[in-house]
C-alpha cells in the first residue's frame, strides 16, 4: 500500500523558518501535490502550495519556496510572521494525487520537544483514499 | 472531502450524443477549475474540457465544436454535453476539479469513479 511520510521542521539559523517535507512510498508517478495546514486537503485545511512535476509550482502566502526535492518527494519553506501564524502548533499535511489511480494523504507537525534544526519526523496519520 | 460522482454514460452510436453530469460537494476551496478527463482503453488520461474560476470554457482540439462544457452552480454540478460522437470518443470520462499551471491544463487534484462511454454500431 502506498505511503506518504510528513516531517516538519524548524529552521536552526532562523526561528521564524520552518520546512515542511513530504515523500511518496510506493508504485506509480505522481501528477499533483497539495500542501495545506490547519487540517487535510477537503477537509477544511488551507493550501499553501500546489506542486505538478512538469508544469511547476504555485504557492500561497506564508508560504516562500516550494520544490521538488526528487521524483516522490517535496520540501516547502514557510515564513513564521509570528502570533498570526503559530506554525509550531499547526498541523501541515500533504497529498500525493496519481491520477487516476488515487490519492494519499499524510499529516505531521513540529516535534513538541524538538530543538531548532533537529529533524526527528512525527509519527504521520495517514488519510487514505481510494477514487 | 471532495465527492464527484458522474453519470450518464452508455453505449451510443456513432453520430450520436449523451450528456455526461457530475454532483460536486464538499469543501473546494483554492481550486481554479473543473473539468473533464477521459482515458481510452490501453491509452494514457487526457483533458478533454474544463471551465476556469472565471468561467471560460477551454477544449480540446479533438472535440472543440462537438462538445460543450457548462456548470450549474446553484446545483453544485458539472456538464458535458457531447455531440457527434465518434468511435475515438470511447473511454472512461472522469469529473476533476484542479489547478491551473497554463491556459491549457487543468491539474486534476480530486476526481469522481468515471463514467464509462461507449460509442460504437
Known amino acids: 500500500t502506498p505511503e506518504v511520510w510528513v516531517q516538519v521542521q524548524m529552521e536552526a539559523t532562523e526561528l521564524s523558518s520552518f520546512t515542511v517535507h513530504c515523500g511518496f512510498l510506493g508504485p506509480g508517478s505522481i501528477s499533483l501535490v497539495t500542501v495545506s495546514w490547519g487540517g487535510p486537503d477537503g477537509a477544511g485545511g488551507t493550501k499553501l502550495a500546489v506542486l505538478h512535476p512538469e508544469l511547476g509550482t504555485r504557492q500561497w502566502a506564508p508560504a516562500r519556496q516550494a520544490r521538488w526535492e526528487t521524483q516522490s518527494s517535496i520540501s516547502l519553506a514557510l515564513e513564521d510572521s509570528g502570533a498570526s501564524s503559530p506554525f509550531a502548533n499547526t498541523t501541515f499535511c500533504c497529498k500525493f494525487a496519481s491520477f487516476p489511480e488515487g490519492s494519499w494523504e499524510s499529516c505531521g507537525s513540529l516535534p513538541p520537544s524538538s530543538d531548532p534544526g533537529l529533524s526527528a519526523p512525527p509519527t504521520p496519520v495517514p488519510i487514505l483514499r481510494a477514487d | 472531502e471532495v465527492q464527484l460522482v458522474e453519470s450518464g454514460g452508455g453505449l451510443v452510436q456513432p453520430g450520436g450524443s449523451l450528456r455526461l453530469s457530475c454532483a460536486a460537494s464538499?469543501?473546494?476551496?483554492?481550486?481554479?477549475?473543473m473539468g473533464w478527463f477521459r482515458q481510452a482503453p490501453g491509452k494514457e488520461h487526457e483533458g478533454v474540457a474544463h471551465?476556469?474560476?472565471?468561467?471560460?470554457?477551454r477544449y480540446v482540439d479533438s472535440v472543440k465544436g462537438r462538445f460543450t462544457i457548462s456548470q450549474d452552480h446553484a446545483k453544485n454540478s458539472l456538464y458535458l454535453q457531447m455531440n457527434s460522437l465518434r468511435a475515438e470518443d470511447t473511454a472512461v470520462y472522469y469529473c476533476?476539479?484542479?489547478?491551473?499551471?497554463?491556459?491549457?491544463?487543468?491539474?486534476?487534484?480530486?476526481w469522481g469513479q468515471g463514467t464509462m462511454v461507449t460509442v460504437s454500431s
Open positions: 476533476v476539479v484542479g489547478f491551473k499551471f497554463d491556459e491549457d491544463y487543468c491539474a486534476p487534484n480530486d
Open positions: 471551465i476556469d474560476s472565471d468561467g471560460i470554457p
Open positions: 464538499g469543501y473546494t476551496s483554492r481550486t481554479d477549475c
